[in-house]
């Protein structure tokens, strides 16, 4: 009797099981019932990563530098090429089609998380006794100084975007 | 028991024809491929020709493609090859070989072709 | 057409040795290859499928191994009933060719 299912890694054509082709290889012609499955390696430029019975092999991706992008890994006849950004830049997609500049954190904002080249900066509002007072993709928000350290008083209270101003302590006649 | 028997053979002029037959016997002879493979004396084993089980698609080499014709009668579990415009290089035994998970895994006795005048 | 090339082409040994029987193809077949013993005025018998699945019947001395290009036939230890002619056999892709034989006889 022909089948009706097939085993994992076949497939079901003119009423027999044909073996599926290997990663890294496409499908030339299907079994019959003298012959295996036919299949070829796919070409330096392309790749299957499944068991297929595709009769093309997909290009590798290319990481155009007109778009911010660089190859992170070369493709093989198994996998595809993954792109990353130049530095700089990150992602915009978890495809990493393009890639647009890593944004500052503002002054009040300071960096919790440096961007990648998949990721983009992450900032986090400057919590009280921290600062930040410039527009930054790198600085983590400092702690205003000690005043008390220097031997010296406050005499102006630090915000989220500028630093205490010190001064000397008054003297007491 | 799993039979196949050749008939047909037999001396033939260059140009001439011939019609070889397989009779099947101890198996489902609808459920499987059959095969013809050659063997000139002395000789190593050569592909002649391929038919599937339905009869629907026919396989043949470069060299026999146009003057051999394989068929099958299903109903008289009955395997056929058909030789025209034979030549000296046809000289052979003859054999005809049941296609068990693609393996020639029965073969028949044979039955000797002569192309010679 | 995918080219099989057997060697040696006569393998002189006594009863009781081990015969080592080499098939190499033109291209990859992966393990898409049998192997046929044929004695003198019979028939080709199959003796393994898939370059190493063994057949019911063949007794357990008759092995093969390989995928790719180079395959083996190993008879552990050869018995008189075992000098013959063996051919090896791709099914990878038409046309089905046959290796040219390796004849096994006694030394």
């Known amino acids: 009797e022909p089948p009706t299912a097939c085993r994992e890694k076949q497939y079901l054509i003119n009423s027999q099981c044909c073996s599926l082709c290997q990663p890294g290889q496409k499908l030339v012609s299907d079994c019959t019932e003298f012959t295996e499955t036919e299949c070829l390696p796919c070409s330096e430029s392309e790749f299957l990563d499944t068991w297929n019975r595709e009769t093309r092999c997909h290009q590798h991706k290319y990481c155009d530098p007109n778009l911010g992008l660089q190859v992170q890994q070369k493709g093989t006849s198994e996998t595809d090429t993954i792109c990353t950004c130049e530095e700089g830049l990150h992602c915009t997609s978890e495809s990493c089609e393009s890639c647009v500049p890593h944004r500052s954190c503002l002054p009040g904002f300071g960096v919790k998380q440096i961007a990648t080249g998949v990721s983009d900066t992450i900032c986090e509002p400057c919590p009280v006794g921290f600062f930040s007072n410039v527009s930054s993709a790198f600085e983590k928000c400092r702690p205003w100084t000690s005043c008390e350290t220097k031997d010296l008083v406050v005499q102006q209270a630090g915000t989220n975007k500028t630093d205490v101003v010190c001064g000397p302590q008054d003297r007491q006649r | 028991e799993v039979q196949l028997v050749e008939s047909g053979g037999g001396l033939v002029k260059p140009g001439g024809s011939l019609r070889l037959s397989c009779a099947a016997s101890?198996?489902?002879?609808?459920?499987?491929?059959i095969s013809w493979v050659r063997q000139a004396p002395g000789k190593g084993l050569e592909w002649v020709s391929s038919?599937?089980?339905?009869?629907?698609?026919?396989y043949y080499p470069d060299n026999v493609k146009g003057r051999f014709t394989i068929s099958r009668d299903n109903a008289k579990n009955s395997l056929y090859l058909q030789m025209n415009s034979l030549r000296a290089e046809d000289t052979a035994v003859y054999y005809c070989?049941?296609?068990?998970?693609?393996?020639?895994?029965?073969w028949g006795q044979g039955t000797l072709v002569t192309v010679s005048s | 057409e995918i080219v099989l090339t057997q060697s040696p082409a006569t393998l002189s040994l006594s009863p009781g040795e081990r015969a080592t029987l080499s098939c190499r193809a033109s291209?990859?077949?992966?393990?898409?290859l049998h192997w046929y013993q044929q004695k003198p005025g019979q028939a080709p018998r199959l003796l393994i499928k898939?370059?190493?699945q063994s057949i019911s019947g063949i007794p357990a001395r008759f092995s093969g191994s390989g995928s790719g290009t180079d395959f083996t036939l190993t008879i552990s230890s050869l018995e008189p009933e075992d000098f013959a002619v063996y051919f090896c056999?791709?099914?990878?892709?038409?046309?089905?060719?046959f290796g040219g034989g390796t004849k096994v006889e006694i030394k």
């Open positions: 038919i599937s089980s339905g009869g629907d698609n026919t």
């Open positions: 070989a049941r296609a068990g998970e693609k393996a020639m895994d029965y």
């Open positions: 898939y370059a190493s």
């Open positions: 056999q791709q099914f990878s892709s038409w046309p089905l060719t």
């Open positions: 101890g198996f489902t002879f609808s459920n499987y491929g």
């Open positions: 291209q990859t077949i992966n393990n898409n």
